[in-house]
């Protein structure tokens, strides 16, 4: 290994020696989170007995990634908290390699192997322990955490049970060969959740798949109640590193989420990209196209970087119920290029949503179905009805144009209105399909300040029904 | 028994430089980090900083950057402040803490401070 | 940075009373709050970590509460001992930041 170990305090020809010295071990036991000292060593059990490591459980490392603090941050501490509070007797090893992680950004990528070999050659000595099973072992990795994992599970003799990869790092690590970041190949199953990744600029999260299942929430980009104005509310002096921070810690919060609130789980849905997920296309839980997120991620039989969407609130518990809805417009006027804004509200046995705006990503299509995509954060239980709105200040300057232009050329004025007969909707959490009746069926058009009210009419679609998340996973 | 142990009072005249220092016992040194404290006369607690002795590593407030240098003898298991061009502000007393490498972990031991005077 | 108020700089009890102290965040500190004792002769000692979790050696007679941004220190059976300067700090955000401290003299 060539690569320069600690930003020039120690350079590496004798690259893993050095690393050892720079790659510590704290094993975090149940039993006593707060000891002090319970570093593990290649080549010295005395701190295993010392510690109460349970040799038969599972064995999770979390590795950090690159600190500007040289401390371990807060993330960490509420992690190591959930996992013992979900698995009560496995072990916990916080993987410090501060020094070298400590250092330029440039310098700690190049130390990213060295470390993974160290993570890898401490798996290879507990191997030869009686009762401890590589496939018991889960690494979790952060960041620039989440290479070294992949590194490591690439250098162990044998196959770790597991990776998930925190929103791992981007610079230096977009595009580039599977043997130098992670990749489906390090473990038997590697999850990844990808927070903050971006087409411009900087993208700090890997933007490709690097998993067996690449979990990309409200799209991997901008996550909620991580916006500039949220920050700067919440912060006396917020500035972008903030948000920065925010979104791509966001990974680690989700991931928190999905061990302690067992209860609230939240599923995630295979699609192609963000933007046909953004149209309520891809809620099928069909042939494994659903899944849970973070440490409810089940390994499933599809083949590797399958790209996977859902939405979230904006802090625990994340999970949101997301609906498709399928609406077709009927046009029986000449109503010209229309971009009107809708607006529904879900009423169910539970309670009634907020007033849900329903996201056009094109454009409507007039006479066609569109679908659409609208979650609550609460759980409405049945759905019972759904109030559409039409807003009444939705016409564009061009529309404003065009309207009068025609009204000068014809002589009657072209009417806004549209025809709506029933709205279909599918839960992805029950994959429940339900259609909806507007109450008379010769009231049918609505036009823009307008309201129409649909009534649960008929269970699914006259189609067959798909299985349910909680029954596939 | 945990113990932080400080070096003595101090007097010296305005951009003078001065050095305290941290003596620990009764723990691994290189288990936990250092943090240092200033407390103004009949003031607040401000943190200055801290080293992780370790490997070296150092972090400190912006306010105190071109201030305090931070330092470690590992083989003495003593930490170092090092204060520069002082002024009459820089007239304290300053606590050493030990503190465990998380965010997290509190200031569980401290020294019992070391009072620094600033004066023509 | 995280500014800590406490809003109470001077407060007089008597032997044997159950006294507060409050400390409140700029904002959410995820519960990331220890609190300090300062005596005269400026020996500072570590009660409470973590909102609530009392320190080894230190008596039960101290606790803590709070979540988001209020936080508080009660002590139950007040001692002679216990009259002294408190200071809260938080550990959630660098740089770490303590109150302005509420001194408890004895009435």
């Known amino acids: 290994a060539e690569e320069q170990l600690e930003g020039g305090l120690r350079t590496a020809k004798d690259g893993p020696a050095a690393a050892k010295a720079a790659v510590r071990f704290h094993l975090r036991t149940s039993k006593g989170p707060e000891r002090e000292g319970c570093y593990l060593s290649v080549g010295h059990s005395q701190p295993l007995e010392d510690c109460s490591f349970n040799m038969t459980a599972k064995t999770f490392f979390i590795i950090h990634g690159w600190t500007m603090s040289g401390m371990l941050e807060n993330w960490l501490h509420k992690l190591v908290s959930a996992l013992q509070m979900r698995e009560k007797d496995a072990n916990v090893v916080v993987v410090d390699w501060l020094p070298l992680a400590h250092q330029l950004y440039t310098d700690a990528v190049n130390s990213t192997r060295v470390v993974g070999l160290s993570v890898a050659k401490m798996l290879d000595w507990l191997q030869g322990k009686d009762g401890f099973s590589l496939g018991n072992v889960h690494l979790i990795g952060y960041s620039l955490g989440a290479h070294v994992a992949g590194f490591a599970g690439n250098f162990v003799k044998g196959t770790v049970g597991r990776i998930t990869g925190l929103d791992p790092a981007g610079p230096m690590f977009e595009g580039v060969d599977i043997h130098r970041r992670l990749s489906p190949d390090d473990a038997d199953f590697v999850d990844v959740l990808h927070t903050y990744t971006r087409s411009f600029g900087i993208s700090i999260g890997i933007q490709m798949p690097v998993g067996h299942i690449d979990i990309y929430p409200n799209g991997g980009d901008f996550q909620p109640g991580c916006g500039l104005n949220d920050v700067l509310g919440s912060i006396a002096y917020g500035t972008i590193a903030e948000v920065v921070k925010c979104e791509h810690e966001r990974a680690v919060h989700l991931f928190v989420d999905s061990l302690v609130n067992q209860d609230k789980p939240s599923f995630a849905f295979q699609c192609t990209d963000s933007n046909r997920f953004k149209k309520g296309i891809c809620l099928s839980c069909r042939k494994n196209r659903c899944n849970g997120i973070g440490y409810n991620a089940k390994k499933t039989r599809n083949k590797r970087n399958t790209k996977m969407y859902l939405k979230t609130r904006a802090g625990m518990p994340f999970r949101v119920y997301h609906y498709q809805m399928k609406i077709h417009f009927f046009s029986y006027k000449s109503v010209g290029a229309i971009e009107p804004t809708f607006y529904v509200t879900l009423y169910g046995t539970n309670a009634e949503s907020q007033v849900l705006s329903l996201e056009i990503v094109e454009q409507i299509g007039l006479n066609a179905t569109n679908t659409f995509l609208v979650y609550t954060e609460e759980d409405l239980g049945d759905l019972l009805k759904i109030k559409l709105t039409w807003e009444g200040t939705s016409r564009s300057w061009y529309d404003l144009w065009r309207e009068f232009r025609s009204y000068l050329s014809q002589p009657h004025r072209p009417e806004r209105e549209l025809s709506i007969r029933r709205i279909r909707v599918k839960s992805g959490e029950t994959q429940r399909r339900l259609t909806f009746c507007v109450e008379d069926p010769e009231k049918t058009s609505i036009a823009p300040g307008q309201e129409l009210w649909f009534y649960k009419c008929r269970d699914g679609w006259r189609m067959k029904n798909e299985t349910s998340p909680t029954v596939e996973l | 028994e945990v113990q932080l142990q400080q070096s003595g009072p101090e007097l010296l005249k305005p951009g003078a430089s001065v050095k305290i220092s941290c003596k620990a016992s009764?723990?691994?040194?290189?288990?936990?980090?250092i943090h240092w404290v200033k407390q103004s006369h009949g003031k607040s607690l401000e943190w200055i900083g801290h080293?992780?002795?370790?490997?070296?590593?150092?972090n400190n407030n912006e306010k105190f950057k071109d201030k305090a240098t931070l330092t470690v003898d590992k083989s003495s298991s003593t930490a170092y402040m090092e204060l520069r061009s002082l002024t009459s502000e820089d007239s304290a007393i300053y606590y050493c803490?030990?503190?465990?490498?998380?965010?997290?972990?509190?200031?569980?031991?401290w020294g019992q401070g070391t009072t620094l005077t600033v004066s023509s | 940075d995280i500014q800590m108020t406490q809003t109470t700089s001077s407060l007089s009890a008597s032997l044997g009373d159950r006294v507060t102290i409050s400390c409140r965040a700029s904002q959410d500190i995820n519960n990331y709050l220890n609190w300090y004792q300062q005596k005269p002769d400026g020996t500072v000692k570590l009660l409470i970590s973590y909102t609530s979790k009392l320190h080894s050696g230190v008596p039960s007679r101290f606790s803590g509460s709070g979540s988001g941004t209020d936080y508080s220190l009660t002590i139950s059976n007040l001692e002679r001992e216990d009259f002294a300067t408190y200071f809260c700090?938080?550990?959630?955000?660098?740089?770490?930041?303590f109150g302005s401290g509420t001194n408890l003299e004895i009435k």
């Open positions: 009764g723990y691994t040194f290189t288990d936990n980090t």
């Open positions: 700090q938080q550990g959630n955000t660098l740089p770490f930041t």
């Open positions: 803490a030990r503190k465990g490498i998380y965010y997290s972990s509190p200031f569980d031991y």
């Open positions: 080293i992780n002795p370790y490997y070296g590593g150092t």
